[in-house]
Interface confidence: low
């Protein structure tokens, strides 16, 4: 999906008002220094591409973030503020329904959500800061 046509300011507002809080809730009890941020993005469409990938694509050790509250709100924001996004996600959603809900927050999932927090922060300051 091409994220260049999204309403970035509306998505930013959704992140600041709810998504950020849900990410913090998910990470509660984890030290902010526990994970190193290895994923970055250089502008807002690029950030949304990476955010979508980490939020909705199952990875080894963390298969089902998509049913978390922050993920559902992310999906809603993208569906509302990115023209045509919903249509591209129909197949992905059908595949997701076949997966079982995660019962335990694994360390891999915590690491992945930590990466997501970094991507969302970069989305709000969209320039790749190479350390």
């Amino acid at each position: 999906y091409d994220f260049t046509n999204c309403d970035f300011e509306k998505i930013k507002a959704a992140y600041l008002s709810t998504i950020s809080k849900d990410l913090i809730t998910y990470m509660s009890g984890t030290k902010s220094t526990e994970f190193n941020n290895t994923v970055s993005c250089s502008n807002r469409p690029h950030c949304l591409t990476e955010i979508q990938s980490l939020t909705f694509n199952p990875t080894a050790g963390c298969a089902s973030l998509a049913k978390e509250m922050f993920a559902m709100k992310t999906k809603a924001a993208l569906a509302i503020w990115c023209p045509g996004y919903s249509e591209t996600q129909i197949n992905a959603t059908q595949a997701m329904k076949k997966r079982r809900k995660r019962k335990v927050t694994t360390n891999k999932c915590l690491e992945q959500v930590s990466q997501l927090q970094g991507l969302w922060r970069r989305f709000n300051r969209p320039l790749l800061k190479q350390q």
């Epitope: 091409d2 502008n43 320039l127 790749l128």
Partner: antibody
Framework: QVQLQQPGAELVKPGASVKMSCKAS????????MHWVKQRPGQGLEWIGV????????TYNQKFKGKATLTVDTSSSTAYMQLSSLTSEDSAVYYC??????????WGQGTTLTVSS | DIQMTQSPASLSASVGETVSITCRAS??????LAWYQQKQGKSPQLLVY???TLAAGVPSRFSGSGSGTQFSLKINSLQPEDFGNYYC?????????FGGGTKLEIK
């Protein structure tokens, strides 16, 4: 409306330094990145570097590291670029320009730097 | 660094004609390309960003297209105020680089 105000010209001697200014108005200064771009007479555009006014983070084009230093004064919404050890190669028009996603939507009028003895 | 190659370097056309300027990136920059117009003695003005999105206030006779490494700027029905220099610039990642420019002159 958004404005980036730059002095029209600077005349300096070879080997000296110059600090040029760019005063921003009409928007929240700390919400946008401030870039500097060089244009030699009859030539194209060269990106020098960028500063984030919210935290003063800077990144430079490798070619201008050691030559340009970017700073800001958030109290006056002003960005500065200092150029050191000036030579005739530094004679050019220097623009400040702002961005959010790496493209430049508003530009200053440019400061013409002349390096001459 | 990503190199941007613009062609042609100069172009002569008449009022009312349609012209195209092309820009090639040395590597994939997806849709992260901007176009600027610069008139003699003036600052550049943003025309197009994200390869195809027109900047505010830019007439609809301007249009951008392309993705990946090949891009173009098309100007339909040239007007006298359209003559000047045009530059492409990738905004994919630092360092940002510009094309060498295209000088559009009146025939």
């Amino acid at each position: 409306q958004v404005q980036l105000q730059q002095p029209g010209a600077e005349l300096v001697k070879p080997g000296a330094s110059v600090k040029m200014s760019c005063k921003a108005s009409g928007y929240t200064f700390t919400s946008y990145w401030m870039h500097w771009v060089k244009q030699r007479p009859g030539q194209g555009l060269e990106w020098i570097g960028v500063i984030d006014p919210s935290d003063t983070y800077t990144t430079y084009n490798q070619k201008f590291k050691g030559k340009a230093t970017l700073t800001v004064d958030t109290s006056s919404s002003t960005a500065y670029m200092q150029l050191s050890s000036l030579t005739s190669e530094d004679s050019a028009v220097y623009y400040c320009t702002r961005s959010l996603d790496g493209f430049f939507d508003y530009w200053g009028q440019g400061t013409t730097l002349t390096v001459s003895s | 660094d990503i190199q941007m190659t613009q062609s042609p370097a100069s172009l002569s056309a008449s009022v009312g004609e349609t012209v195209s300027i092309t820009c090639r990136a040395s590597e994939n920059i997806y849709s992260y390309l901007a176009w600027y117009q610069q008139k003699q003695g003036k600052s550049p003005q943003l025309l197009v960003y994200f390869a195809k999105t027109l900047a505010a206030g830019v007439p609809s006779r301007f249009s951008g297209s392309g993705s990946g490494t090949q891009f173009s700027l098309k100007i339909n029905s040239l007007q006298p105020e359209d003559f000047g220099n045009y530059y492409c610039q990738h905004h994919y990642d630092t360092p940002w680089t510009f094309g060498g420019g295209t000088k559009l002159e009146i025939k």
